[in-house]
Amino acid sequence: EVEKTACPSGKKAREIDESLIFYKKWELEACVDAALLATQMDRVNAIPFTYEQLDVLKHKLDELYPQGYPESVIQHLGYLFLKMSPEDIRKWNVTSLETLKALLEVNKGHEMSPQVATLIDRFVKGRGQLDKDTLDTLTAFYPGYLCSLSPEELSSVPPSSIWAVRPQDLDTCDPRQLDVLYPKARLAFQNMNGSEYFVKIQSFLGGAPTEDLKALSQQNVSMDLATFMKLRTDAVLPLTVAEVQKLLGPHVEGLKAEERHRPVRDWILRQRQDDLDTLGLGLQG
């Protein structure tokens, strides 16, 4: 907390400029008008203020906007955003994707901080759903973003947004999350032809039910082992040896290398030895 002291003669700030970096903390508090700061926030980032000076500027904005900053100020916070607490951010009403991008840019290259997580949460809740443009933006900054959401949160993702999802965005998703995303992806890509459809749906298949895997096995898709290993155990177990052979195509030989690993091991255990022998891989049930 900076003490209230009168501004020395001739030091009253007329604009936000580099001369302010020479002001002591108490001088910034006394000589910079909060309303001026709010209207010239875009200039703050061009000036090499110390962390302590930024604390004073934040304090002035907090006094001016005790109920939370307006979006016109939020959009130009720049590095001052790093000074905000999640409690500060919960007071905001961020509706513009440009504002979101500007603040994410400040945190770029770092792990998702509690501040960023709160900002994203506020933004998405304000929009009511995770639309394609928002998802595009968030996954560009944080490839693991989608997998950080709970299954309940993912249920608000409309199928149209699925087009924005890249395979790497799903790398850390667990089975429960893919259970939610797969039906959306199936709906989003339903009008694509066989081979194009498989390319798009492949990274979501960890949420696919048995009947969809059976259908894919009839389409010469040649699923790779990495994808097969991510399939749901309950979806894999009912597949016959012939269906798995068709599903994997030339990749079926890879089952040997994975025979001790789930879900391959679980599937092998439940097949007739005679059927396994038809693969010629030496798999033991």
Partner: antibody
Framework: QVQLQESGPGLVKPSETLSLTCTVS??????????WSWIRQPPGKGLEWIGY???????NYNPSLKSRVTISVDTSKNQFSLKLSSVTAADTAVYYC???????????WGQGTMVTVSS | DIQMTQSPSSLSASVGDRVTITCRAS??????LNWYQQKPGKAPKLLIY???SLQSGVPSRFSGSGSGTDFTLTISSLQPEDFATYYC?????????FGGGTKVEIK
Amino acid sequence: QVQLQESGPGLVKPSETLSLTCTVSGGSVSSYYSTWSWIRQPPGKGLEWIGYIYYSGSTNYNPSLKSRVTISVDTSKNQFSLKLSSVTAADTAVYYCARDNVFTGFDIWGQGTMVTVSS
Amino acid sequence: DIQMTQSPSSLSASVGDRVTITCRASQSISSYLNWYQQKPGKAPKLLIYAASSLQSGVPSRFSGSGSGTDFTLTISSLQPEDFATYYCQQSYDASYTFGGGTKVEIK
């Protein structure tokens, strides 16, 4: 609901064979979704998985014990059994039988039986 | 074999504390990771399966997260009945392995 109960001698002499049986009640050992495991815990130590069996008779053993272990299943009696040969004092432990549900893990355990290896 | 390393091996906490136990696999095990609670003289009890799914009947203060090699068990607000030893276990590889255990004691 499914319950498991271990039975067998509590004292075994060194170099002899330890034999335990697990009786499954309230369910079938022939369950499609379950394998049946033996797990042990030496006094004051952690858990060690010994091996499992499927109702078809397929088995899978801990590599460190494989040469001494045999697990078998008797579907008519709804039981599965453990035999551990050439025991030493290091095999003294509480032995548990457990159901390994393919979707959830070891979701049902017996209460455990203490086996001491001593002359 | 896949080695499972738990940390810490023991911890002291008070009722109401948030407790976090970590488990690291020596190679990727996808989401095939389970957590168990064991009290003295009793058989272990399944708490969390598939890394993050809560077993039926287990209080919601228990949660699990992680995939690949790094996993976490969290107790959001420790209760008197939660003082016990906790084990992680991988079921990805056919040779199942447990972590060494974490004993949660009263501070």
